[in-house]
C-alpha cells in the first residue's frame, strides 16, 4: 500500500481542516488508514483522523482545530496499521480556503433596485470577519449567455443592483463566495443559490 | 464558553492528604492539556503540574515530584491532584487550567488549601 | 528552568495615559517560525488570571486593543495605550517554551 498523490490540506481558519490524498489502489480508507495530526507546542498531544473515501483510491479527512493563529504548524502522519506512508506538516494560515456564505437573500421590494445580502460566514472574533471579500454569481435559468459576476471589494456583505440591468419577467439565480487577500486565501465554495423573478416598470418613454 | 470549577480545598494538619478536583465544561475535554497553578496568599503565580490530552503524559516542577500527583477522568470531564505530605507552605489557592498552544487559556476560580496544625 | 524578570514591582498610573511592562526572560523563547513563546496574564483583585496575550503578540479572544505584546528572544513588553480603572490589577508574564512553566513576579498596577 503506497501514497500516489501525497496528502494536500487546507484551512477554514476557524474549526476545520480538509486533507486529501489519493492511494495507489482502492483503499477502505476508513478501516485501512488513520492520520495523525499534533500541533507543534508545548504540551501539545497527537489527535486522529479517521478518513472517508472519495472516489476509489482518493481519501478526505476533516481535522479538528482550534482557532487558528498565523504561529499555528501541525506534523502529520499517515497511518495504515503499523506502516508509517508519510510524514509532512501543514501550516493552516498559509493553506487557506474560507467558509462559505450563508443566507444569500434577494429583496426585490425596493423601487427598481434589487438587494442581495448575505452572511459573513465567521464570528466577529475571528481574523477573516473583517477581511474578506466576496463575488457575487447572477445567471439567467433561461439564457445559459446571461452569466455575469460581479466583485464585491467593500466589506459589507450586501450589493445592490439596477434590476432593470437584468432582463424583466424572467427568472434569475445567485451565489456568493468569498475570498480574503490577507492571507492570498483560496476561493470559497460557492453558496447555495437563491432564485427570483425579476420583473420592474419600464421607463415611461416620452415621443 | 470554557468552565472550570475546582473543588477539595480545605484546611489539613501537615503531613496529611488532599484531593483536589476540576470540573470541565464547555470544550472537548480530552482534547486538552491541563495543568495546576497555585498561588500562596499576597504571592505570585506558580506552575505545579500539567497532563496531556489523554493522560499518558504528565509534567511537573521540581520542587512538586514524588508529592503531588496530577490525573484526570476523560469520561466524566474532570482533573485532579492528589497532594500528599503537606507542608505549612504549601497553603495556597490552587487553580486548574485549560492549556493550549503551551498557554493557559481559561481558569478556574480556585479552590484554597489550608496547611496548619 | 527559565527565569522569568519582571519590571517594575509597582506601576502607578493615571486614567487615559499610556502604560507598559517589562518582562526579562533567562533564555530565548523565540521560535524559529517568527514568534515567541510568552504570554502576558492580568489578575484583577479577588480574581483568577486571565489570559491577555500569547504567543508574544496575539490578544486573547475578549481583550481591549488597547493591549498589545511587543518584544522577542528575551525582552518583552506589555503596553497599555489609553489605561482604564478597570485594568487595575497584578500581570504577570509567563513562559511557555519549556516545563516547567515559569512567571514572572508581577507588576502591580494602581491607580494614583
Known amino acids: 500500500m503506497k501514497v500516489l498523490q501525497e496528502p494536500t490540506c487546507v484551512s477554514d481558519y476557524m474549526s476545520i481542516s480538509t486533507c486529501e490524498w489519493k492511494m495507489n489502489g482502492p483503499t477502505n480508507c476508513s478501516t485501512e488508514l488513520r492520520l495523525l495530526y499534533q500541533l507543534v507546542f508545548l504540551l501539545s498531544e497527537a489527535h486522529t483522523c479517521i478518513p472517508e473515501n472519495n472516489g476509489g483510491a482518493g481519501c478526505v479527512c476533516h481535522l479538528l482545530m482550534d482557532d487558528v493563529v498565523s504561529a499555528d504548524n501541525y506534523t502529520l502522519d499517515l497511518w495504515a496499521g503499523q506502516q508509517l506512508l508519510w510524514k509532512g506538516s501543514f501550516k493552516p494560515s498559509e493553506h487557506v480556503k474560507p467558509r462559505a456564505p450563508g443566507n444569500l437573500t434577494v429583496h426585490t421590494n425596493v423601487s427598481d433596485t434589487l438587494l442581495l445580502t448575505w452572511s459573513n460566514p465567521y464570528p466577529p472574533d475571528n481574523y477573516l470577519y473583517n477581511h474578506l471579500t466576496y463575488a457575487v454569481n447572477i445567471w439567467s435559468e433561461n439564457d445559459p449567455a446571461d452569466f455575469r459576476i460581479y466583485n464585491v471589494t467593500y466589506l459589507e456583505p450586501s450589493l445592490r443592483i439596477a434590476a432593470s440591468t437584468l432582463k424583466s419577467g424572467i427568472s434569475y439565480r445567485a451565489r456568493v463566495r468569498a475570498w480574503a487577500q490577507c492571507y492570498n486565501t483560496t476561493w470559497s465554495e460557492w453558496s447555495p443559490s437563491t432564485k427570483w423573478h425579476n420583473s420592474y416598470r419600464e421607463p415611461f418613454e416620452q415621443h | 464558553e470554557v468552565q472550570l470549577v475546582e473543588s477539595g480545598g480545605g484546611l489539613v494538619q501537615p503531613g496529611g492528604s488532599l484531593r483536589l478536583s476540576c470540573a470541565a465544561s464547555?470544550?472537548?475535554?480530552?482534547?486538552?492539556?491541563m495543568s495546576w497553578v497555585r498561588q500562596a496568599p499576597g504571592k505570585g503565580l506558580e506552575w505545579v503540574s500539567a497532563?496531556?490530552?489523554?493522560?499518558?503524559?504528565?509534567y511537573y516542577a521540581d520542587s512538586f515530584k514524588g508529592r503531588f500527583t496530577i490525573s484526570r477522568d476523560n469520561s466524566k470531564n474532570t482533573l485532579y491532584l492528589q497532594l500528599n505530605s503537606l507542608r505549612a507552605e504549601d497553603t495556597a489557592v490552587y487553580y486548574c487550567a485549560r492549556n493550549l498552544r503551551g498557554g493557559l487559556h481559561g481558569w478556574g476560580q480556585g479552590t484554597l488549601v489550608t496547611v496548619s496544625s | 528552568d527559565i527565569v522569568m524578570t519582571q519590571s517594575p514591582l509597582s506601576l502607578p498610573v493615571t486614567p487615559g495615559e499610556p502604560a507598559s511592562i517589562s518582562c526579562k526572560s533567562s533564555q530565548s523563547l523565540h521560535h524559529g517560525q517568527g514568534y515567541n513563546r510568552l504570554d502576558w496574564y492580568l489578575q484583577k483583585p479577588g480574581q483568577s488570571p486571565q489570559l491577555l496575550i500569547y504567543l508574544g503578540t496575539h490578544r486573547a479572544s475578549g481583550v481591549p486593543d488597547r493591549f498589545s505584546g511587543s518584544g522577542s528572544g528575551t525582552d518583552f513588553t506589555l503596553k497599555i495605550s489609553r489605561v482604564e480603572a478597570e485594568d487595575v490589577g497584578i500581570y504577570y508574564c509567563?513562559?511557555?517554551?519549556?516545563?516547567?512553566?515559569?512567571f514572572g513576579g508581577g507588576t502591580k498596577v494602581e491607580i494614583k
Open positions: 509567563m513562559q511557555t517554551h519549556q516545563t516547567p512553566l515559569t
Open positions: 497532563i496531556g490530552g489523554s493522560g499518558g503524559h504528565t
Open positions: 464547555g470544550f472537548t475535554f480530552s482534547r486538552y492539556a
